[in-house]
């Protein structure tokens, strides 16, 4: 807290500009009006403000704003988004893209902090769903970010903007999560044809039922291991022999190298030692 | 998952008209495709026509084309099957079923082996 006093002759800024760098603390509260600080937000990143100075700064616009900032103001934060709390933030009513954008990038290369979560949080409140431009944001900045909602939250998420997500950004799902996201993206694919619906599908399908794989398997699909070994064990189990053989094609061989993994594991043990033996990889059920 | 509930058998005599329906739950997808198979006494399941949902385009097995027509209600999430000029060898237990997925609309085809949702059937009696 700064002590209230009077600003010194002359020292009174008519401007954000480089001059304040040499200002005490003191000299700052005093002499730098809040509402001329707000107006001018998008000056205060292009000086060397030292983190006290900051403080200053962002004690003047808590007194100014006690109900939370305006956006127009949060939209020019920039460095000063970094001396926010989580309780600062949730006063806030941000709406639009591109704030969130600034701010996310003044972040930009760090992990994930309390402040920009409960950014990300309020914005997507605020929107009432997780649209596709907004999930384009997040995802370019966090590519994890997906993968941090609870099932619940994901619920919100339109199929429309499962366009957004890259294969990258399912890494880190689990399967709760996949199961919420899989029939989203049917949704969202199912107009594409053969190859290319495969293509864009190959990655949720970590929440796909028996039904869907025993459809695919049946149509030259080619799946990889990678993709196999991601799929719910309780989706596999019922697969035959031969329908392992034709969803992976030519890639069957690799479930030699995977025969002690899961859901490998427990396929094996479901068959048939005769049916595993017509693959001829030696594997053991 | 689908779940699938025919309706509308019943008996007829020859040359007449049914009209099966069957109700469809859970999403239903573009890439879909829905088939109705019949089963005779003492004979194998066989294919009796199919419908790609999206597009609509259908596939008649060749015992029935002409007299037979399927259609889909979408927003009831109903698969018809209009049969005119019923013969008595049309007579048999008429299943409703559904692939989940088809890459290709060629792949709809009403080929016992591709279908993985089924309904319960319901019977169909025609006599001369």
């Known amino acids: 807290e700064v002590e209230k006093t009077a600003c010194p002759s002359g020292k009174k800024a008519r401007e954000i500009d480089e001059s304040l760098i040499f200002y005490k603390k003191w000299e700052l509260e005093a002499c730098v009006d809040a509402a001329l600080l707000a107006t001018q937000m998008d000056r205060v990143n292009a000086i060397p403000f030292t983190y006290e100075q900051l403080d200053v700064l962002k004690h003047k616009l808590d007194e100014l704003y006690p109900q939370g900032y305006p956006e127009s103001v949060i939209q020019h934060l920039g460095y000063l988004f970094l001396k926010m709390s989580p309780e600062d933030i949730r006063k806030w009513n941000v709406t639009s893209l591109e704030t969130l954008k600034a701010l996310l990038e003044v972040n930009k290369g760090h992990e994930m902090s309390p402040q920009v979560a409960t950014l990300i949080d309020r914005f997507v409140k605020g929107r009432g769903q997780l649209d596709k431009d907004t999930l384009d944001t997040l995802t370019a900045f966090y590519p994890g970010y997906l993968c941090s909602l609870s099932p619940e939250e994901l619920s919100s998420v339109p199929p429309s903007s499962i366009w957004a997500v890259r294969p990258q950004d399912l890494d880190t799902c689990d399967p709760r999560q996949l199961d919420v996201l899989y029939p989203k993206a049917r949704l969202a694919f199912q107009n594409m044809n053969g190859s290319e619906y495969f293509v864009k599908i190959q990655s949720f399908l970590g929440g796909a039922p028996t039904e869907d794989l025993k459809a695919l398997s049946q149509q030259n699909v080619s799946m990889d291991l990678a993709t196999f070994m991601k799929l719910r064990t309780d989706a596999v189990l019922p697969l035959t022999v031969a329908e392992v053989q034709k969803l992976l094609g030519p890639h069957v061989e690799g479930l030699k190298a995977e025969e002690r993994h899961r859901p490998v594991r427990d396929w094996i043990l479901r068959q048939r030692q005769d049916d595993l033996d017509t693959l001829g990889l030696g594997l053991q059920g | 998952q689908v779940q699938l509930a025919e309706s509308g058998g019943g008996s007829v005599q020859a040359g007449g008209s049914l009209r099966l329906s069957c109700a469809a739950s859970?999403?239903?997808?573009?890439?879909?495709?829905m088939g109705w198979f019949r089963q005779a006494p003492g004979k194998e399941r066989e294919g009796v026509g199919s419908i790609y949902i999206g597009g609509g385009y259908t596939n008649y097995s060749e015992s029935v084309r002409g007299r037979f027509t399927i259609s889909l209600d979408n927003a009831k999430k109903t698969l018809n099957l209009q049969m005119n000029s019923l013969k008595p060898e049309d007579t048999a237990m008429y299943y409703c079923?559904?692939?989940?997925?088809?890459?290709?609309?060629?792949?709809?085809?009403?080929?016992?082996?591709?279908?993985?949702?089924w309904g319960q059937g319901t019977q169909v009696t025609v006599s001369s």
């Open positions: 859970g999403n239903l997808y573009n890439n879909m495709c």
């Open positions: 079923a559904a692939i989940p997925i088809a890459l290709t609309r060629a792949f709809c085809a009403p080929i016992v082996s591709r279908y993985t949702y």
